[in-house]
Interface confidence: low
C-alpha cells in the first residue's frame, strides 16, 4: 500500500491489501476502503463502468463478468485499485467482440482473462486456420491480446482468443478483424470536363469523382478566389475493401455570365491534398469568330491552284457553311470539319480548294457561317496573274501603229525598232499615247492598256516590235516596213 | 438607408490600444463582407483588413499583422477593429467599408462610412 | 504583394475637357480592378468595378478599360463635380489601391 510523508494526502488503503485478487464463481467479493475522505468505489471491465459511494464493496455471489479493476478515490483526488479475477470455468474470456485496426497502429483484441492462472494464452485462427506469419501480438491478462502494427492484408481476419486451461485448449467467442486503411497517398481527383462554356441561363453541371482507400477522405467544390458555399450532391460506391469512390456533383441550374469562373474539387486525407479544376465560361450569346489562314488578298497565277483557308471558333455548333463566287453557292471543292475531336471544341476549318484558274476565275470569294444566334463571314479578293495576250496590233489611217495588250498585273508594252532584216530589235522607240482602256471596269479581270507610236518616223525598210510584258511573262508582235520609191506600206503584221 | 457609422477614434500614445466600432444599418449586415479601410493625412487609402461573412476568415494587411484584430457581431450589426501596440505611422482616418462582389470572384467595396480618426502621438 | 501605379497624380482641366487616367498593376489582375472617387473631408465613393461596369447612380460620362496590367479610366466630358480624387484598386490578391490622382480646375 501506498505511504507517504505526513501533512500531505495519502491516498486510500484498500483491505484485502493486494494488487490482485483471485475469487471463486458463486464465492463473495468484499473490499473495504480505509481513508477519512472516502469518496467512492468505481469498477471498470471492458466498456463497462459502475460506481458505488459505501466505503466497503460486496458482491455476494460473484460471477465472470464481475472480473475486473476496483478503484477507491478520495476527496482529494488520490486512487488506490485491486484488480480482481472472478475464476469461472464455464467463462474464461470476457469478449466485447467488436474490433477495429487501423493500418499501421496496434489495436487490442478485448478478451480478458478471469483466471489468471491459466496458460498459453494467444490468438488462434478460426477453423484451425493459422494466422498471418507476420502477425505479433502481446497478451496481457487484465486487458486482452494486443496485435502489433495491423496490416491491411490482416482485414476481415476470424480470429479467437485461446487459453489453455486445466490441460484444454479454450476459445472465445470468435472476432472478425476490420481494418481502416491508412493514408499513403493523396486521393486520386478527376473531373468530368476541364471547361465548360454555356449560354446564360443553361445549366452547369460538373462531376468531380475522388477515389481513396476509405470514406473518410474529405472533399469539397471550391470557387477561386471566393468564400461563397457552393450547392453540391453526393453519390459513393465501396469497389472491394480499400477501394472508395465518391462523385461530387456541382450544378449551378441556370448559369450567369458572372458565374463564369475557375471551380476547383478539393480533396484531402491525412496524407496530403489533391485537387483539379474546370473552368466555366458563360456568354450572354453565341458566337462566331473566323480567322484566315491565309492573306485575304491572293495573287495565283493562271492555271495554278490556291486553297483558301478558315479557321473559326463557333458556339454554339455550326449549322450553315458555305463558299460563294459570284452569287453562286460552291457544291463541292470544299470541306469543313471540327479542329479536334474534343467534345468541347468550338474550333473549326473551312477549306475551298480553287484548281487551275482562269484569268476569268478571279474575284470576291466569300466564306459564310452561322449557328442558332449568329451569323458571319469573311471575303478573300483573288486576283488571277496572266501572261500579257495582243489583242490588236494594227496600222491606223493616221498613220500610227497601235498595239493593245491585256494582262494581270498590268501590262507595259515597249516599243523597238530592227533596221533591216534583224529579229533582234534593241533601239526603242516613245510611245506617243498609253492608255489604260478597263481601269474603272471590273476589278478582277485582265487590265487592257493601248499603246501607240508615229510610223512616220521611220525612213528605212525593217521591223517595229510592240512588246507586252508584266510579272508573268511578255508576248511580242512585229510590223514589217518595206519602201516602193517614196511609198512606205505596211506589210503583214505578225507575232 | 444603407449606412456605416464608425466610432472609437481618438488620441492615444504610442503603444497604446484603441478599439474602433461601426455600427450598420439599412441591409442585412450578415450576408455581407466587411473591411476596414485607413488614410493618412494628406495620403492616398490603404486596405487594413477584412472579414468573410460566411466562414469568418480574417485577412490583415502585412504591417499590421499580430497587432490589429478584425471581429464581427452580426446579431449586433457591428464591425470592429481591436488595435493593440499602436504606432505614429498608424495615425489616419480609419473607413468601415461594405464587400460587395462581381461574379463571386472577387470584392469590391460599395458602401463606406464617414470615417474615424485615429491619432497616435507622445 | 501587387502594387498599382497611377498616373499622372495630378492633372488640370476645364469643364467639358476629356480627362483619362491611367493605372498599372505590378502583375497581371485580368479584369479585377475598381475605381473611386473622394472629395476632400468625404469617403470614396464606388464608381466603376471589374474594369468597365458603372456603379449604380454613377453617371455615363465615366467610363473604364483594359486588362491584365494596364487600365485606364476615361471622363468623356468634365463637369464641376468632377474634381476630386481617384484611386484605383486591384481585388486579384487581397487589396491594394494606387497613389491616386487628383483633377484640379484649370
Known amino acids: 500500500q501506498p505511504s507517504v510523508s505526513p501533512g500531505e494526502p495519502s491516498p486510500p488503503s484498500i483491505h484485502p491489501a493486494k494488487s490482485e485478487l483471485i475469487v471463486r464463481v458463486g464465492n463473495e467479493i468484499r473490499l473495504l476502503c480505509i481513508d477519512p475522505g472516502f469518496v467512492k468505489w468505481t469498477f471498470e471491465i471492458l466498456d463497462e463502468t459502475n460506481e458505488n459511494k459505501q466505503n466497503e464493496w460486496i458482491t455476494e455471489k460473484a460471477e465472470a463478468t464481475n472480473t475486473g479493476k476496483y478503484t477507491c478515490t478520495n476527496k482529494h483526488g488520490l486512487s488506490s485499485s485491486i484488480y480482481v479475477f472472478v475464476r469461472d470455468p464455464a467463462k474464461l474470456f470476457l469478449v466485447d467482440r467488436s474490433l477495429y485496426g487501423k493500418e499501421d497502429n496496434d489495436t487490442l483484441v478485448r478478451c480478458p482473462l478471469t483466471d489468471p492462472e491459466v496458460t498459453s494464452y494467444s490468438l488462434k485462427g478460426c477453423q484451425g486456420k493459422p494466422l498471418p506469419k507476420d502477425l505479433r501480438f502481446v497478451p496481457d491478462p487484465k486487458a486482452g491480446i494486443t496485435i502489433k502494427s495491423v496490416k491491411r492484408a490482416y482485414h476481415r481476419l476470424c480470429l479467437h482468443c485461446s487459453a489453455d486451461q486445466e490441460g484444454k485448449s479454450v476459445l472465445s467467442d470468435k472476432f472478425i478483424l476490420k481494418v481502416r486503411p491508412a493514408f499513403k497517398a493523396v486521393p486520386v481527383v478527376s473531373v468530368s470536363k476541364a471547361s465548360y462554356l454555356l449560354r446564360e441561363g443553361e445549366e452547369f453541371t460538373v462531376t468531380c469523382t475522388i477515389k481513396d482507400v476509405s470514406s473518410s477522405v474529405y472533399s469539397t467544390w471550391k470557387r477561386e478566389n471566393s468564400q461563397t458555399k457552393l450547392q453540391e450532391k453526393y453519390n459513393s460506391w465501396h469497389h472491394g475493401d480499400f477501394n472508395y469512390e465518391r462523385q461530387a456533383t456541382l450544378t449551378i441550374s441556370s448559369a450567369r455570365v458572372n458565374d463564369s469562373g475557375v471551380f476547383m474539387c478539393y480533396a484531402n486525407n491525412t496524407f496530403g491534398s489533391a485537387n483539379v479544376t474546370t473552368t466555366l465560361e458563360v456568354v450572354d450569346k453565341g458566337f462566331i469568330n473566323i480567322f484566315p489562314m491565309i492573306n485575304t488578298t491572293v495573287f495565283v497565277n493562271d492555271g495554278e491552284n490556291v486553297d483558301l483557308i478558315v479557321e473559326y471558333e463557333a458556339f454554339p455548333k455550326p449549322e450553315h457553311q458555305q463558299w460563294i463566287y459570284m452569287n453562286r453557292t460552291f457544291t463541292d471543292k470544299w470541306e469543313d470539319y471540327p479542329k479536334s475531336e474534343n467534345e468541347s471544341n468550338i474550333r473549326y476549318v473551312s477549306e475551298l480548294h480553287l484548281t487551275r484558274l482562269k484569268g476569268t476565275e478571279g474575284g470576291t470569294y466569300t466564306f459564310l457561317v452561322s449557328n442558332s444566334d449568329v451569323n458571319a463571314s469573311i471575303a478573300f479578293n483573288v486576283y488571277v496573274n496572266t501572261k500579257p495576250e495582243i489583242l490588236t496590233y494594227d496600222r491606223l489611217v493616221n498613220g500610227m501603229l497601235q498595239c493593245v495588250a491585256a494582262g494581270f498585273p498590268e501590262p507595259t508594252i515597249d516599243w523597238y525598232f530592227c533596221p533591216g532584216t534583224e529579229q533582234r530589235c534593241s533601239a526603242s522607240v516613245l510611245p506617243v499615247d498609253v492608255q489604260t482602256l478597263n481601269a474603272s471596269g471590273p476589278p478582277f479581270g485582265k487590265l487592257v492598256v493601248q499603246s501607240s507610236i508615229d510610223s512616220s518616223a521611220f525612213k528605212h525598210n525593217g521591223t517595229v516590235e510592240c512588246k507586252a510584258y508584266n510579272d508573268v511573262g511578255k508576248t511580242s508582235a512585229y510590223f514589217n516596213f518595206a519602201f516602193k520609191g517614196n511609198n512606205k506600206e505596211q506589210i503583214h503584221p505578225h507575232t | 438607408e444603407v449606412q456605416l457609422v464608425e466610432s472609437g477614434g481618438g488620441l492615444v500614445q504610442p503603444g497604446g490600444s484603441l478599439r474602433l466600432s461601426c455600427a450598420a444599418s439599412?441591409?442585412?449586415?450578415?450576408?455581407?463582407?466587411m473591411a476596414w479601410v485607413r488614410q493618412a493625412p494628406g495620403k492616398g487609402l490603404e486596405w487594413v483588413a477584412s472579414?468573410?461573412?460566411?466562414?469568418?476568415?480574417?485577412y490583415y494587411l502585412d504591417s499590421v499583422r499580430g497587432r490589429f484584430t478584425i471581429s464581427r457581431d452580426n446579431a449586433k450589426n457591428s464591425l470592429y477593429l481591436q488595435m493593440n501596440s499602436l504606432r505614429a505611422e498608424d495615425t489616419a482616418v480609419y473607413y468601415c467599408?461594405?464587400?460587395?462582389?462581381?461574379?463571386?470572384?472577387?470584392?469590391?467595396?460599395?458602401?463606406w462610412g464617414q470615417g474615424t480618426t485615429v491619432t497616435v502621438s507622445s | 504583394d501587387i502594387q498599382m501605379t497611377q498616373s499622372p497624380s495630378s492633372l488640370s482641366a476645364s469643364v467639358g475637357d476629356r480627362v483619362t487616367i491611367t493605372c498599372r498593376a505590378s502583375?497581371?489582375?485580368?479584369?479585377?480592378l475598381n475605381w473611386y472617387q473622394q472629395k476632400p473631408g468625404k469617403a470614396p465613393k464606388l464608381l466603376i468595378y471589374?474594369?468597365?461596369r458603372l456603379q449604380s447612380g454613377v453617371p455615363s460620362r465615366f467610363s473604364g478599360s483594359g486588362s491584365g496590367t494596364d487600365f485606364t479610366l476615361t471622363i468623356s466630358s468634365l463637369q464641376p463635380e468632377d474634381f476630386a480624387t481617384y484611386y484605383c484598386?486591384?481585388?486579384?490578391?487581397?487589396?491594394?489601391f494606387g497613389g491616386g490622382t487628383k483633377v484640379e480646375i484649370k
Open positions: 471589374y474594369t468597365s
Open positions: 467599408a461594405r464587400g460587395d462582389y462581381y461574379g463571386t470572384t472577387y470584392w469590391y467595396f460599395d458602401v
Open positions: 439599412g441591409f442585412t449586415f450578415s450576408d455581407y463582407y
Open positions: 472579414i468573410n461573412q460566411n466562414t469568418g476568415s480574417t
Open positions: 484598386q486591384q481585388g486579384r490578391r487581397l487589396w491594394s
Open positions: 502583375q497581371s489582375i485580368s479584369s479585377y
